[in-house]
């Protein structure tokens, strides 16, 4: 493959990353598929400044990052270390809360209204992030 | 209603150390980050630290890294400012100033206490 | 770090003159961008938040506007209480700066 020199279309660059910014929901699984899809992943927040520019673009409202403890430990999907990076939970959380109702506890998270991170069941149909690196290689074929 | 009351200013000599304290109250301390803010002697607002909520995150103005240290006790709804190797140049009021976790404005503040450095 | 600057530094106005002061980033804030008023020997006070949100309690003679870089504040009809020095600040990037300052002054 080729490297990437420039963001899709509809993608939104910032610092050597391409972000999509849904207006739609999914569940988290859902939505990490259509950004696999998309030769990207669910977005893994590294930065204070990098929280910032992804809570401009969504505004506030739940959407899902790149970020879950499914099997067990904290996990970004992009294999980002969680205990030494960068987290931005809300106070309490997060919680692995089983109150719900909808079986089970909470094991994705997502970008509240102010800005910082909950946990809840994955199944939620939120809105979501995708983020390519734009110094990776594309899965398509260079153009001749 | 919220208030904030910083404390510990005083005249100091350079190179020497001193601590600032902000009082708070009137609200839920330990769910607010907070930041320190100086001015001085007829100059403009200079942004100095912020701290998060509960104390997992710190973040400097370049001028005084290495030199102070913002922290808190969530159990005394305090915030602290410990000031090292201070300076003629950090002489100023020093005020505190909760953060809005969206924003990072600071939406209430301390009246401040004024810190001078001089021989 | 980002750099802020304000202009004018200082303006003489009459009670219900309008008035607007310009704040520029030396790059992109998004929409990280406040604005404060203080009077002497008194803390700043929030006034707009998120370049156009006007803070709880402040009147709606003061607004806010910009985006990206450049950025203003406008009062529509200047009180005899607004007389103060302006300063805007970038929340955007660590350290957070502010500019520095315009001084609304009583012509």
């Known amino acids: 493959g080729s490297e990437r020199t420039c963001c899709p279309v509809n993608w939104v660059e910032h610092e050597r990353s391409c972000y999509w910014f849904s207006r739609s929901g999914k569940a988290w699984a859902d939505a990490d598929n259509y950004c696999r899809l998309e030769d990207a992943h669910l977005v893994v927040v590294t930065s204070w400044e990098e929280q910032k520019f992804v809570q401009h673009h969504i505004g506030p409202v739940n959407t899902w990052m790149g970020l879950h403890d499914q099997n067990g430990p904290w996990k970004w999907v992009d294999g980002t270390d969680y205990e030494t990076g960068f987290k931005n939970w809300r106070p309490e959380q997060p919680d692995d809360w089983y109150g719900h109702g909808l079986g089970g506890g909470e094991d994705c998270a997502h970008f509240t209204d102010d800005g910082r991170w909950n946990d809840d069941v994955c199944q939620r149909p939120y809105r979501w992030v995708c983020e390519t690196e734009l110094d990776k290689a594309s899965q398509e074929p260079p153009l001749l | 209603q919220v208030q904030l009351v910083e404390s510990g200013g005083g005249v100091v000599q350079p190179g020497r150390s001193l601590r600032l304290s902000c009082a708070a109250s009137g609200f839920t301390f330990s769910s607010y980050g907070m930041h320190w803010v100086r001015q001085a002697p007829g100059k403009g607002l200079e942004w100095v630290s912020v701290?998060?909520?509960?104390?997992?995150?710190?973040y400097y103005e370049d001028s005084v890294k290495g030199r102070f240290t913002i922290s808190r006790d969530n159990s005394k709804n305090t915030l602290y400012l410990q000031m090292n190797s201070l300076r003629a140049e950090d002489t100023a009021v020093y005020y505190c100033?909760?953060?809005?976790?969206?924003?990072?404005?600071?939406?209430?503040w301390g009246q401040g206490t004024l810190v001078t450095v001089s021989s | 770090d980002i750099q802020m600057t304000q202009s004018p530094s200082s303006l003489s106005a009459s009670v219900g003159d309008g008035v607007t002061i310009t704040c520029r980033a030396s790059?992109?804030?998004?929409?990280?961008l406040n604005w404060y008023q203080q009077k002497p020997g008194k803390a700043p006070k929030l006034l707009i938040y998120?370049?156009?949100s006007l803070q709880s309690g402040v009147p709606s003679r003061f607004s806010g506007s910009g985006s990206g870089t450049d950025f203003s504040l406008t009062i529509s009809s200047l009180q005899p209480e607004d007389f103060a020095t302006y300063y805007c600040q970038q929340s955007y990037s660590t350290p957070f700066t502010f500019g520095p300052g315009t001084k609304v002054d009583i012509k």
């Open positions: 100033a909760r953060d809005h976790p969206r924003w990072s404005y600071g939406d209430y």
């Open positions: 790059q992109t804030i998004l929409s990280y």
């Open positions: 701290i998060w909520y509960d104390g997992s995150d710190k």
């Open positions: 998120g370049v156009s």
